[in-house]
């Protein structure tokens, strides 16, 4: 038996740094969708009511408690009749997979904020990305949310060669040894080693010494 006409399918959570959107199929014809998400009291909260989109931004709900495991469902209604129901007296609906933001949100591509050379040492700083998670009316950074669960890996190499070295840190800073007179290039990756899925971000854009971001001091 196929999916009944109008019923949503392929419900998928798309989440990066806690910005979280539920997507589904198909594009509606003669019907609309309404999304519900279960809150921490296990009540269903209505979102994106009567939409003809096939996505719904649920960020403002999931950031209330990023450690909570959420479930959503997409309800289908004939166009212009939000009261219309299926044969069992309920609207057609499809449940999403469960989603735990802290464990599953993708780590966004990090950015190298700066690097500074002092003699044969280079200090590399990773930008502490702001998330949409709030506490006490302020937005928390990625580090604020993940704490020591989040590490960064630095890949660095001489501009004149391809041999990469790595360093890791539990903060947003690295301090690496370099050869004097050599230019180096850098890229960083965010990692949550304790995760089973979505453990690593994509690599940051490469930054090289001799370009804008760096500073050199004898």
């Amino acid at each position: 038996a196929g999916t009944p006409p109008g019923k949503a399918f392929n419900l998928t959570w798309i989440s990066t740094d806690f910005k979280t959107i539920l997507e589904w199929q198909p594009k509606p014809t003669n019907y609309t969708y309404t999304v519900q998400i279960s809150d921490r009291s296990r009540n269903w909260k209505y979102k994106c009511t009567g939409t003809t989109d096939t996505e719904c931004d649920l960020t403002d709900e999931i950031v209330k408690d990023v450690n909570w495991t959420y479930e959503a469902r997409v309800l289908s209604y004939p166009a212009g009749n939000v009261e219309s129901t299926g044969s069992a007296g309920e609207p057609l609906y499809e449940n999403s997979p469960e989603f735990t933001p802290y464990l599953e949100t993708n780590l966004g591509q990090p950015t190298i904020q700066s690097f500074e050379q002092v003699g044969t040492k280079v200090n590399v700083t990773v930008e502490d990305e702001r998330t949409l998670v709030r506490r006490n009316n302020t937005f928390l950074s990625l580090r604020d949310v993940f704490g020591k669960d989040l590490i960064y890996t630095l890949y660095y190499w001489k501009s004149s060669s391809s041999g990469k070295k790595t360093a890791k840190t539990n903060t947003n800073e690295f301090l690496i040894d370099v050869d004097k007179g050599e230019n180096y290039c850098f890229s960083v990756q965010a990692v949550i080693p304790s995760r089973t899925v979505n453990r690593k971000s994509t690599d940051s854009p490469v930054e090289c010494m001799g370009q804008e971001k760096g500073e050199f001091r004898e």
Partner: antibody, heavy 125, light 108 residues
Framework: QVQLQESGPGLVKPSQTLSLTCTVS?????????WSWIRQHPGKGLEWIGE???????RYNPSLKSRVTISVDTSKNQFSLKLSSVTAADTAVYYC??????????????????WGKGTTVTVSS | EIVLTQSPGTLSLSPGERATLSCRAS???????LAWYQQKPGQAPRLLIY???TRQTGIPDRFSGSGSGTDFTLTISRLEPEDFAVYYC?????????FGGGTKVEIK
């Protein structure tokens, strides 16, 4: 120089909640360190209970997680431990500690470098 | 959890002698997260070594740490009277952070 001081009742009845506070002096609790609780049963080794960042991000020992809450009050420069449903097995010296970043191998890693003197908590009726 | 086993449980030595303390992990530990602490009776532990081999500021150079993977060692090259205490290794890379059971270095 950062100093830590634990405070709280030395005697707690079984099934009640143990509550301790650690006051940080000589530095800000919001300055990028983590703040930990560790305990030591009489004549025994050390057991890590959990830690908190100034933002409220926590990590707990799974063996105690269902009973432990660690919180932070940045306005008072304090962090606190609550351990519920205590039994005699929770009798121990409780230490608070600072987890600060140290340079190693190209990066920075956290180690417990400043400890309070410890406070003895006895669970007994 | 990672279990750290320290041996021997007690080490009886005289001042001036060399002390070698062992810490063995049940699974591989990243050296970046391995520390050694000293604890004297009635006192809180004190950080001696971090990153398996780096001395904390103010720690005398008679203390040295080494090792990687599952086997780590703390060496006190010449015991001073103030070194008689209990020593703990600790890993802080995997939750729960764990301590070894301790080695007591006592005066012979």
């Amino acid at each position: 120089q950062v100093q830590l001081q634990e405070s709280g009742p030395g005697l707690v009845k079984p099934s009640q909640t143990l509550s301790l506070t650690c006051t940080v002096s000589g530095g800000s609790i919001s300055s990028g360190q983590y703040w930990s609780w560790i305990r030591q049963h009489p004549g025994k080794g050390l057991e890590w209970i959990g830690e908190i960042y100034y933002s409220g991000s926590t990590r707990y020992n799974p063996s105690l997680k269902s009973r432990v809450t660690i919180s932070v009050d940045t306005s008072k420069n304090q962090f606190s431990l609550k351990l519920s449903s205590v039994t005699a097995a929770d009798t121990a010296v409780y230490y608070c500690a600072r987890d600060a970043p140290y340079y190693y191998g190209g990066g920075y890693y956290y180690y417990m470098d400043v400890w309070g003197k410890g406070t003895t908590v006895t669970v007994s009726s | 959890e990672i279990v750290l086993t320290q041996s021997p449980g007690t080490l009886s030595l005289s001042p001036g002698e060399r002390a070698t303390l062992s810490c063995r992990a049940s699974e591989s530990v990243d050296s970046s997260y391995l520390a050694w602490y000293q604890q004297k009776p009635g006192q809180a532990p004190r950080l001696l070594i971090y990153g398996a081999s780096t001395r904390q500021t103010g720690i005398p150079d008679r203390f040295s740490g080494s090792g990687s993977g599952t086997d780590f060692t703390l060496t006190i090259s010449r015991l001073e009277p103030e070194d008689f205490a209990v020593y703990y290794c600790q890993q802080a890379g995997v939750v729960p952070y764990t301590f070894g059971g301790g080695t007591k270095v006592e005066i012979k």
